[in-house]
């Protein structure tokens, strides 16, 4: 029986370790600056890295600019979006800016999109300063179902900071749904 | 066999509970305001509390101003940095400020430092107002290896808010590396 | 013995799954805009949704405007607070604003309140722009005991954005206390 107990313990260690890893999807996606849309209106950002530098993904899928949930669960979602402008980039069309991010969830079954989180600020980026910068951070805990998609919308995408430490979003599973 | 099963269950509860606790390092470090550097340029903040008030640490190490990872894993890292100025503190050398935070990772094996997250804003803190305040929050999910070090760099450190609820950073392990 | 082992494994799967779910309280509370206080001074926000839209709660209690901890543990706490003003809402009493959030913990046993996290910014919302917006995000990792209460205080509550994606706070348990 002792050998059997050891076997039970051993198999359990494997099972617990395996199920724990399988049960924890995550993603950290960083902006792909080679394909940032222009304009000042709200647009969906579709180009993100998932496998270079700090970017990584596991048990989730990145497709068509969206982060797809493969496993039901409660997830912590976050986004960090940085905007910047240097006078050498040219004159701004307006000095009054609305710098915003929207983290949205789309359900395929019911083709509808809903904003989970938003953040940002109106800014006055006057010509008195040669450089302007502003960052937004949002985060929250949400129930996500397999097949649902997370995407990022921003205003003024041409002002995005293209660094991987500046503009990114991500998710990690915290627990199962009861 | 029932007694054996109960024993297995009991030992498993202990094992599961113990391994779960061992597997989840964390830290929440709050600014030590007795030793904030002066200057307006980017500096590394080396004085943090780890065992008073809200500050705490477990299965990680704080040494030489850096948070040292003791256990491989995926961690959620975060920082909250508050800057403030009251006219009674003296005159600002410039009203145009770049208030920034950089969360950096240093690897001992490959002596190099990389920025994981950055945030902040350019601000115009005019003399028309007697008090100014601004906070930055950043957070993200990163793979950290044992021996790697996390540190915080800020601009204008003399403007930091010294309260423990204002200026802090932390990390907690979410899952193992596959 | 094989049948017994299968039974052990089966009961363990149930037990592990059940205990894991029981061990992970969470809440995501969104602003109830039907009852936002007026004024510009710091006030405690007591009206939050816990069961509609993105709002949800499990193994925690929402009562009297406070999020009550039912289970000892280390929790990640977060808040996202959005302020906005449109000129059609009327003139601001002052264009110099202090837009702040304070996440506080109250212990019933020792009737005292302490600020865990704060964030915000001073803003100059001039009449030159018809619309103003600003969001704050804070987050951190804290030890919470059963019976302790989390509440949100803000300045200028009449400027709060009432959308569920804009003004919310939450918590989720990450690990037990050793």
């Amino acid at each position: 029986i002792r050998a059997e107990k050891a076997m039970v313990d051993g198999s359990w260690l494997d099972l617990a370790k395996r199920s724990k890893l399988e049960a924890q999807p995550f993603a950290h996606l960083t902006i792909n600056a080679t394909d940032i849309p222009s304009g000042s209106h709200k647009v969906s950002l579709s180009s993100w890295y998932h496998d270079r530098g700090w970017a990584k993904i596991s048990n989730m899928t990145f497709s068509n600019g969206k982060l797809i949930v493969n496993q039901d669960g409660f997830y912590y979602l976050y986004a960090n979006i940085c905007f910047r402008h240097h006078e050498t980039s040219g004159d701004l069309a307006t000095e009054y800016l609305q710098l915003m991010v929207y983290v949205t969830k789309t359900s395929i079954k019911i083709p509808s999109s809903h904003t989970l989180m938003k953040g940002g600020s109106t800014k006055y980026w006057s010509g008195n300063s040669e450089f302007h910068f502003y960052s937004i951070n949002v985060g929250g805990f949400f129930k996500l179902r397999s097949g649902e998609e997370i995407s990022i919308e921003v205003s003024n995408p041409s002002l995005l900071d293209p660094d991987q430490d500046a503009t990114y979003f991500g998710a990690f599973k915290v627990r199962d749904i009861d | 066999i029932r007694a054996e099963k109960a024993m297995v269950d009991g030992s498993w509860l202990d094992l599961a509970k113990r391994s779960k606790l061992e597997a989840q390092p964390f830290a929440h470090l709050t600014i030590n305001a007795t030793d904030i550097p002066s200057g307006s340029h980017k500096v590394s903040l080396s004085s943090w509390y780890h065992d008073r008030g809200w500050a705490k640490i477990s299965n990680m190490t704080f040494s030489n101003g850096k948070l040292i990872v003791n256990q491989d894993g995926f961690y959620y890292l975060y920082a909250n940095i508050c800057f403030r100025h009251h006219e009674t503190s003296g005159d600002l050398a410039t009203e145009y400020l770049q208030l920034m935070v950089y969360v950096t990772k240093t690897s001992i094996k490959i002596p190099s430092s990389h920025t994981l997250m950055k945030g902040g804003s350019t601000k115009y803190w005019s003399g028309n107002s007697e008090f100014h305040f601004y906070s930055i929050n950043v957070g993200g999910f990163f793979k950290l290896r044992s021996g790697e070090e996390i540190s915080i760099e800020v601009s204008n450190p003399s403007l930091l808010d010294p309260d423990q609820d204002a200026t802090y950073f932390g990390a907690f392990k979410v899952r193992d590396i596959d | 013995i094989r049948a017994e082992k299968a039974m052990v494994d089966g009961s363990w799967l149930d037990l592990a799954k059940r205990s894991k779910l029981e061990a992970q309280p969470f809440a995501h509370l969104t602003i109830n805009a039907t009852d936002i206080p007026s004024g510009s001074h710091k006030v405690s926000l007591s009206s939050w949704y816990h069961d509609r839209g993105w709002a949800k709660i499990s193994n925690m209690t929402f009562s009297n405007g406070k999020l009550i901890v039912n289970q000892d543990g280390f929790y990640y706490l977060y808040a996202n607070i959005c302020f906005r003003h449109h000129e059609t809402s009327g003139d601001l009493a002052t264009e110099y604003l202090q837009l702040m959030v304070y996440v506080t913990k109250t212990s019933i046993k020792i009737p005292s309140s302490h600020t865990l996290m704060k964030g915000g910014s001073t803003k100059y919302w001039s009449g030159n722009s018809e619309f103003h917006f600003y969001s704050i995000n804070v987050g951190g990792f804290f030890k919470l005991r059963s019976g302790e209460e989390i509440s949100i205080e803000v300045s200028n509550p009449s400027l709060l954005d009432p959308d569920q994606d804009a003004t919310y706070f939450g918590a989720f348990k990450v690990r037990d206390i050793d």
Epitope: F131 | G39, S40, H41, G90, D91, L92, A93, E95, N156 | -
Partner: nanobody, 127 residues
Framework: EVQLVESGGGLVQPGGSLRLSCAAS????????MGWFRQAPGKGREFVGF????????YYADSVKGRFTISRDNAQNPLYLQMNSLRPEDTAVYYC????????????????????WGQGTLVTVSS
């Protein structure tokens, strides 16, 4: 890497005028507080003047007060030192530098309070 480049120096007769410029490249410093210093042959570096980032406050050494004026463009890089009523004792290499503190301290006239020095531009006042 930050670089400051001074220009505008030259030979001028006593009583004449010169306008020095200081341009920054690399990191943004157009809105940092800055200072002008000078070093005469065989002497130490001497404080000339200081200007805040907004240009709203200036300080001068007693030896140049009323004759020299520091200014800066609204948004562009250059920092200026307008020198009038020049004297032979103003002969020196003139340097601009970035003030390193967030607050204006009582030691703003000390060279140790400044970073990112330029190479300097020579001003010679002689008849």
């Amino acid at each position: 890497e930050v670089q400051l480049v001074e220009s505008g120096g030259g030979l001028v007769q006593p009583g004449g005028s010169l306008r020095l410029s200081c341009a920054a490249s690399g990191r943004t410093f157009s809105r940092s507080a800055m200072g002008w210093f000078r070093q005469a042959p065989g002497k130490g570096r001497e404080f000339v003047g200081f200007i805040t980032g907004s240009g709203g406050t200036t300080y001068y050494a007693d030896s140049v007060k009323g004759r020299f004026t520091i200014s800066r463009d609204n948004a562009q890089n250059p920092l200026y030192l307008q020198m009038n009523s020049l004297r032979p004792e103003d002969t020196a290499v003139y340097y601009c530098a970035v003030y390193r503190r967030t607050y204006i301290s009582s030691t703003y006239s000390e060279s140790s309070e400044y970073d990112y020095w330029g190479q300097g531009t020579l001003v010679t006042v002689s008849s």
